[in-house]
Every structure is written in C-alpha cells, then in structure tokens.
C-alpha cells in the first residue's frame, strides 16, 4: 500500500477505561496531529478506519464491529464500548484515508479492573479545593457524549468506600458535589457513579478523582525570606567553609512558579568563577504551601569571597523579595604574649 | 537520558527548495518549554546560526534549501521544568522530476499535496506555505500542468487560488510557487498539489452543522432575560446529541442550584435532505459572572458558542 | 429570479452592534461566494466582505476588520453580518451581492441603511 | 491597496452622443475589471467584467476595453436611460476597491 503519515504511538493519551463500563474514545488524529477536523475530512471523502493490536501481540487487525448488541460500534470520530471487555486492552489505531491521502495515529487503551471501594490502578485526575473558602463544587468528569440531554441519568457519589450521605459539609448535587467549606479532613478519593439507560440495557460509568485541600487565595502572601535574615552573621575565617541557607516559605497558589535564586554581586552563581554549589530541598505542608532552602556552599572561602555581597531572591504569582546575607571576615582573637 | 518519545512525523520533500518544520505538540509546547532540534540521534545540537544552511530558528528547523543528502530523521527535544519529550521526523529527499515539456519547466511533484474542487461552484485551492517569521514570502504564482495559469476564472488572492465555475477539466496537477528572502537570499519554493474534482452531492455529509451560533459575541444589558437558538442541520438518521454547555458541563447541570440558565426542549424542521434543529438556552437574568464565558452548542462532533459582552458605555 | 434581500438595518448608537441579514433566492446559494459592500449616502462604493461558498474563505476591508463578522447558512439560504463597535463612519446603505468570477457582483440586493448616532 | 481613479467625475452628454469613460489603477490588475451602472435609489448593475465581456442583458451600446492599468467604458450611442453614475472596480487583489464614480447627466 502507499505511503501513510504514521505518527506512531501516541503515548501522550495513556487511555484507562473500566472493565464492564461504556467507553467512547475520539480519535486523536483530530484533536491533536491534523489541522482539520473530523467534518471537513469526512465532507471531503476521506474514509476514517479502526483496528487494533491486542496486547503482547504483533498482528494488527480490523476491530470486529459485528459483536452482539453492538459491544464495540464506531460513529463519527468516536470508538464506542457498550460496555469493555478487559481483553480489550491493546494499541488502537485511527487510520483516514482515501485513495490519494493517508494518516494514521495509534495509542495505548487499557482496560482496568476496579474493586468493590473503587479501587484500581486508574490515574486519578487531582482537584485542589481552597481550604475555607467558601461553597465549591467539583463535577463527575468526562461523561459527555454518553447519553442524550434527554436521559436523566442517577448520580451516586461517594468518598472512599462510604455513599455520601448526611455529610456535613458534603452535598451531592446531581453531577456536581459541593463542599460547603472545605477542610483538610475532605481530602481523599471521590467517585460519582452515573447510571443510565439505552435501549432497555442500563450502564454504569464510575468516575473517581482525587481533592486535596489546599491554601486559599485569601490568606496568601508574597514569598517570605526566613533565611538570611539580620540576626544571623556569617562570619567565616579564609579557608572555612562557607554555607548559607536561603529558606523561603510560599503560601499556596494555583498555577504559580515558586523560583528561588542567589546572586553573588549581582551576578547569578553560574556567571561567576567561584566555586559555588547549591543544593535544594523542597517540603509542603498539608495545604501544599512549600518552603524551598537552597543552600549556597563555597568549600575554602577567600577574603576576597568574605567581601562579596550575597542575596537570596524569591519570587511567585504574588511578588518578588529578596534578602541579604550578613557576611563577614572573622577578626582573630588577640594573642598576649608575656615578656 | 529520561525523555519520552512521543511519536514520528514522516515528511516527503523535494531538494534544492526551502523547508522547514516547526515542533509543536501542543499539550506539551503551550507551556513554557525549550527546544532543541539534533539529527539522526547526534549529541550535537542543529546549529543557531541564521547563515547555516541548516538552522534552528525558535522552534522551527529551516533549511535553505534542502539538499538530496539532508534526508535522515531529526529528532526536537522539548524540555520543560519536569519534562522531557522526543518528537521524530523522518525527512525523505528526493530529486526533482522536471516536467517533460522542457528542461526549465516546473518539477512534476505528485504526493506533496491533494486538494479538492468542487464541482460548479466557486471555490478556491490553497498553498500551504509554512515558515518561521524570518521568512519573507513574494507573491505567489500558480501553475498547471506546468503552465502558469492565466484566465478569467482564476484570481490569485493572498495564498489563495481562486476558481470560479470549477468544471471537470479543472483536476490535475498544480504547483503553487513563491520566493522566500531570507537574511537578504532568495530562494524558490514550490509546492505541487494534485487537485480532484468532487461531484454535486446532495446535503454534504453527516457532521452536523452549526449555522447559529457563529463563535461570536452577544452585547446584553445587565439583568435582563436572553433566549438564544443554536440551529443546527444534520442528516435525517443522525444520532447526534444537541445540547449547552459551559465550562463542559451542561447547562442544566451547571446552574442546577439556582436554575437561572436553563436548555430549552429541542424542536426540528423536516427538509427533504436534512433536519434542522433549534435548542436555545434562556437566561432568566444576565448576571455578572456570565460576561465573557463561552457558553457552548454542541452538536454531535461540531461546537459553536456565544460570549455575552456588556453593552459600550452610552455617554449622551 | 435572482433575488437578494437585506433586513436589519436601522439606527444605533456608537459602540454598540447590529446583525444584518441578507436571504437569497433564484439561483443555487452554495456555489457561489457573497459579498457585502456599502455606500455611504452621497459616496462611492466601499467593498466590506466576502465569504465562500463553504465559508472557507473570508475576507474583510481594513477599515473593518475585527469589527465585523460575515456568515452564512446554506441551509436557509442566508448571508449574515455581525458588525461589533459600530462607529459613525459605518454609517451606510448596504448591499449584498452574489459573486461572480468570485469577486466581481452580477446581482445586488436594495440594500439595508444602516445609521450610527448618538 | 489598488486605488482606482475614474475620469472625468462628471460628463455632460445629449442623447445619441458617444459617451467615453477612463478608469485608471494605481498597479496592474491584469484585465481583472468591471464596470457597474448606478441610478438613483437604485442598486450597482454589472455591465461589463473582466475588461471587456458584456453581462447578461446588457445592449451591444456598452463596450470595454483596456488592460493592465488603463481601462475605458464606451457607451456608443447614449439612451435615455443611460444617464446615471458608472463605477470601476478590481478583483485582481484583496481588498476589492471600487473607483469613485462617473456621472454621465443629461447636457
């Protein structure tokens, strides 16, 4: 056959799906590899094609679309599962083509079992709730596309193993699950089960993530330098090594880039011929605020080093600090000599 | 050395004509990122230098022009503060096939490029030029069949071949070509397309079609009640879901609590060909929260939204 | 017959927006491009915008680009123009007009008056 | 963008005279031109495209010629009727423009 645009496969879409559970898969060739999409290609006679390779096999074949009631059915750009089979896992390929034109896109689909408490090897999607902020919702995700506006499905949400039910500060809402005021002891994993029916046959689709409580935006603050600070002095003799801990704390911020950075007169570390190493360490508190040390060491400092000026920069969504070190050349004791 | 391939990008080139391919994979490259362009797995990166022939220009591999011997697979890397990922792109060169008219004619590229016409319409074909900013592209010039098109059913426009009436002896082979500057040196490039020509067809395929809303936005007062349609056209046997959504829930979900946004019960109109479809969504009051959110139609594949604007000042 | 009408003209005020309308009849709409052009009371005629038959290819004069959006719906054999931030030198008749050789217009509509004033 | 500019504005003719109308462009546009005639309170109508190919239903009295810049409309004998304002325009780039206008008015 002539030549198609493989793109190989696509390990980007790590696709995981439940055993016994619909699945309606779109094909990526469209969402991410080919300028047009699935409309204009089909308008201009181009024929969208599926198979697949089981797992720990070679040998692609077509996908058998013939399977009573219609376990596994293509419509538009989307594979549909009613329901999966977990000796379904296996590399899927997308191929469009024509006479003239060919393009083809695989990618991994694993289908995953899951426990009677929902748990399973599934990649759980994280969603950060600000702690006491306020009502919050979180929704049951990617169940688009699976039944008509007309269909009302039942959602059934639970933490952990346990059905939500009179919580206090919990409340099921239909495809959303509102947190009255979000504390740390709501962290952990939530799963809403939606239930729905289609041509007599019912379908559960179970949907779980995990929240984690973290800092709100009310209480954050720009970058607080807690070493160096005025009451410590780094006072070294030459030949001593010389260390100073740059420790930074950052309140939490959504999406924020938490940068901490020393410069030695002026300049960056890299810059400069000293030899200087820097060592970070990074620890967070349960509402993912972080404190970031770096620690500036120069193995045998030089008078000359004990003259520089050393600051430690930070910097996040909420602003820019910096601070000096207290450096200085130790004076030696004076020696009494006895005439 | 820890980076994930991600996957491989076959291209067939001519020689002794510019090229150049850009990296990006966008749920990667929208971030902050950098990339590095190496060939056939060499430690050593593509050069920066904008007077090599072959160059790295921000995220693009250039080259001015591409040579027979330049075939081989390039590898970007593009790394981001905890990442690493690999895209291949395996370049084939092949020598030009000159036309048979003569020696000076234009190369005879077959695969490079197919595009369609449409039968009776007016309709237009397209060269696809893709460069970095440092290319100049000259205006463009189209040919067929190894003759420069001239005529009154053709216009140039942009990178656009305009065709008005296409009739059936409009298929064939095209070649659009333009001068590229770059650095004050000129080179050619020339794209071949093949063109087919498509029949009268009736209602065209079976995605559905949004014809309102257009992606546009709606100037609304504050407080007020809003009824906007989605209309859309689709095949008689669809199964297509039509419905509102925003922030990708549906509308009815979203504003569950309050019910202040609700869909409305879907209607059609049967054509001979097709149905059209009305579902509107009601704003019982625009509240302040709602300026600048798409609110979104789908239809099946095809989405189309509205953003709701406040109404320019009224300084009388 | 060949005909175009316009609709939804009127009087608006700077800053705000209007949609115009153009339904066409007498020919099949979805072979040809259609294009908007305007004519200030007592001017020439100013080209504003064009849009394929497949809404492929659109086109706008400067003076209202980014302003202005042209759509149409085959389905209802309808032309469309969304004009955003309207100012007083809009301030215009406007036609619409089926292409011909895609960018010449063999059939006007009467046009629809379009006034921008506060 | 190609600026058209039409001469005269204004032509003062009888009825049976020979009337010469002169479009020029401001770069070539190949023979990408048409002539429109406007009465009014009345919308353009298409005369003449692509320099000199007559419209449906236009008399054999209208003709045009030219190509590159320099583009004429004649009208050989005037009627009654072909007393109103006559326009250029191009279609050989984006923008398409339009020339400002020739009134042809009874002398």
């Known amino acids: 056959s002539e030549r198609c645009d493989d793109w190989g496969l696509d390990t980007m879409r790590q696709i995981q799906v439940f055993e016994d559970e619909p699945a309606r898969i779109k094909c990526p060739l469209f969402e991410h590899f080919l300028k047009f999409n699935y409309s204009t290609a089909h308008s201009a006679g181009l024929t969208l094609i599926w198979y697949w390779t089981r797992q720990d096999r070679d040998l692609e074949e077509p996908i058998n679309f013939r399977l009573p009631e219609n376990r596994i059915s293509k419509e538009k750009d989307v594979l549909w599962f009613r329901p999966t089979l977990l000796n379904d896992t296996g590399n899927y390929t997308c191929m469009l083509r024509n006479t003239t034109y060919c393009s083809k896109v695989a990618f991994p689909l694993e289908v995953v079992q899951k426990d009677s408490c929902f748990n399973s090897p599934m990649k759980l999607p994280v969603h950060k709730l600000y702690i006491e902020y306020g009502i919050q919702r979180i929704t049951c995700p990617n169940v688009d596309g699976y039944f008509p506006s007309s269909v009302k499905p039942t959602i059934t949400w639970y933490m952990g193993c346990y059905k939500i039910q009179n919580f206090n500060n919990v409340i099921p809402e239909g495809m959303n699950l509102s947190f009255l005021i979000a504390l740390i002891s709501n962290n952990g994993n939530y799963t809403c089960v939606v239930t729905y029916p289609e041509n007599g046959r019912t379908f559960h689709l179970t949907r779980t993530l995990t929240v984690k409580v973290v800092g709100s935006p009310k209480n954050a603050v720009p970058p607080v330098i807690h070493s160096p600070n005025d009451h410590v002095v780094y006072e070294k003799e030459p030949g001593e090594e010389l260390l100073i801990p740059c420790t930074v704390y950052f309140s939490f911020l959504m999406d924020s880039r938490n940068e901490v950075w020393w410069t030695i007169d002026g300049k960056k570390p890299d810059d400069i011929t000293i030899d200087v190493t820097i060592n970070e360490s990074i620890s967070h508190s349960r509402t993912e605020d972080e404190t970031r040390t770096q620690i500036l060491s120069i193995k045998k400092v030089t008078s000359e080093d004990l003259k520089r000026s050393y600051v430690c920069h930070a910097r996040s969504a909420k602003g820019e600090v910096a601070k000096a070190a207290k450096v200085k050349q130790k004076v030696p004791a004076p020696r009494y000599t006895v005439e | 050395d820890g980076c994930k391939d991600i996957f491989m990008k076959n291209e067939i080139l001519s020689a002794s004509q510019p090229f150049a391919f850009n990296c990006t994979f966008p749920p990667i490259t929208s971030g902050e990122v950098s990339v590095t362009w190496y060939k056939n797995s060499s430690k050593i990166p593509v050069s920066k230098i904008i007077q090599s022939r072959i160059h790295q220009d921000e995220t693009w591999i250039l080259f001015l022009p591409m040579e027979w011997g330049d075939s081989g697979v390039y590898q970007c890397v593009i790394k981001g503060r905890d990442s690493c990922h690999r895209i291949h792109v395996n370049l084939t060169v092949f020598e030009k096939h000159w036309c048979d008219t003569s020696i000076g004619g234009l190369p005879n590229l077959s695969d490079e490029y197919k595009q369609i016409l449409h039968l009776g319409k007016d309709d237009s074909l397209t060269c696809h030029l893709h460069f970095p900013k440092s290319c100049v592209l000259g205006p463009i010039k189209w040919y067929k069949d190894c003759n420069e098109i001239k005529g009154e059913r053709f216009t140039v426009l942009e990178t656009r071949l305009l065709v008005s009436n296409v009739s059936a002896e409009d298929r064939g082979n095209y070649a659009c070509q333009a001068i590229l500057t770059h650095s004050g040196k000129q080179y050619e490039v020339l794209n071949g397309i093949t063109v087919s020509i498509t029949e009268r067809a009736g209602y065209g395929g079976s995605v559905p079609k949004i014809i309102y809303p257009k992606n546009h936005s709606i100037e609304v007062q504050l407080g007020t009640t809003l009824i906007v349609d989605c209309n859309v056209t689709d095949t008689k046997d669809n199964t297509n879901l039509r419905c509102w959504r925003v922030n990708n829930t549906l509308v009815d979900d979203y504003y569950d609590e309050s019910k202040r946004i609700r869909e409305g019960v879907e209607t059609h109109v049967s054509f001979r060909e097709h149905n059209l479809y009305t579902v509107n969504i009601t704003f019982l009051e625009v509240k302040m929260e709602d300026y600048g959110l798409p609110f979104m139609c789908h239809a099946g594949v095809s989405t189309a939204y509205i953003i709701l604007q406040l109404p320019a000042p009224d300084f009388r | 017959e060949v005909q175009l009408v316009e609709s939804g003209g009127g009087l608006v005020q700077p800053g705000r927006s209007l949609r115009l309308s153009c339904t066409a009849s007498?020919?099949?709409?979805?072979?040809?491009?259609i294009h908007w052009v305007r004519q200030s009371p007592g001017k020439g005629l100013e080209w504003v915008s064009v849009?394929?038959?497949?809404?492929?290819?659109?086109g706008y004069a400067d003076s209202v680009k980014g302003r202005f959006t042209i759509s149409r719906d085959n389905a209802k054999n309808s032309l469309y123009l969304q004009m955003n931030s309207l100012r007083a030198e809009d301030t215009a008749l406007y036609y619409c007009?089926?292409?011909?050789?895609?960018?010449?217009?063999?059939?006007w509509g009467q046009g629809t008056l379009v006034t921008v004033s506060s | 963008e190609i600026v058209l500019t039409q001469s005269p504005a204004t032509l003062s003719l009888s009825p049976g005279e020979r009337a010469t109308l002169s479009c020029r462009a401001s770069?070539?546009?190949?023979?990408?031109l048409a002539w429109y005639q406007q009465k009014p309170g009345q919308a353009p109508r298409l005369l003449i495209y692509?320099?000199?190919n007559r419209a449906t239903d236009i008399p054999a009295r209208f003709s045009g010629s030219g190509s590159g810049t320099d583009f004429t409309l004649t009208i050989s004998s005037l009627e009654p009727e072909d007393f109103a304002v006559y326009y250029c325009?191009?279609?050989?780039?984006?923008?398409?423009?339009f020339g400002g206008g020739t009134k042809v008015e009874i002398k």
């Open positions: 007009a089926k292409g011909y050789n895609w960018n010449f217009f063999d059939y």
């Open positions: 007498g020919f099949t709409f979805d072979d040809y491009a």
């Open positions: 849009i394929s038959w497949n809404s492929d290819v659109i």
């Open positions: 770069q070539s546009v190949s023979s990408y």
């Open positions: 692509n320099a000199a």
């Open positions: 325009q191009q279609r050989s780039n984006w923008p398409l423009t």
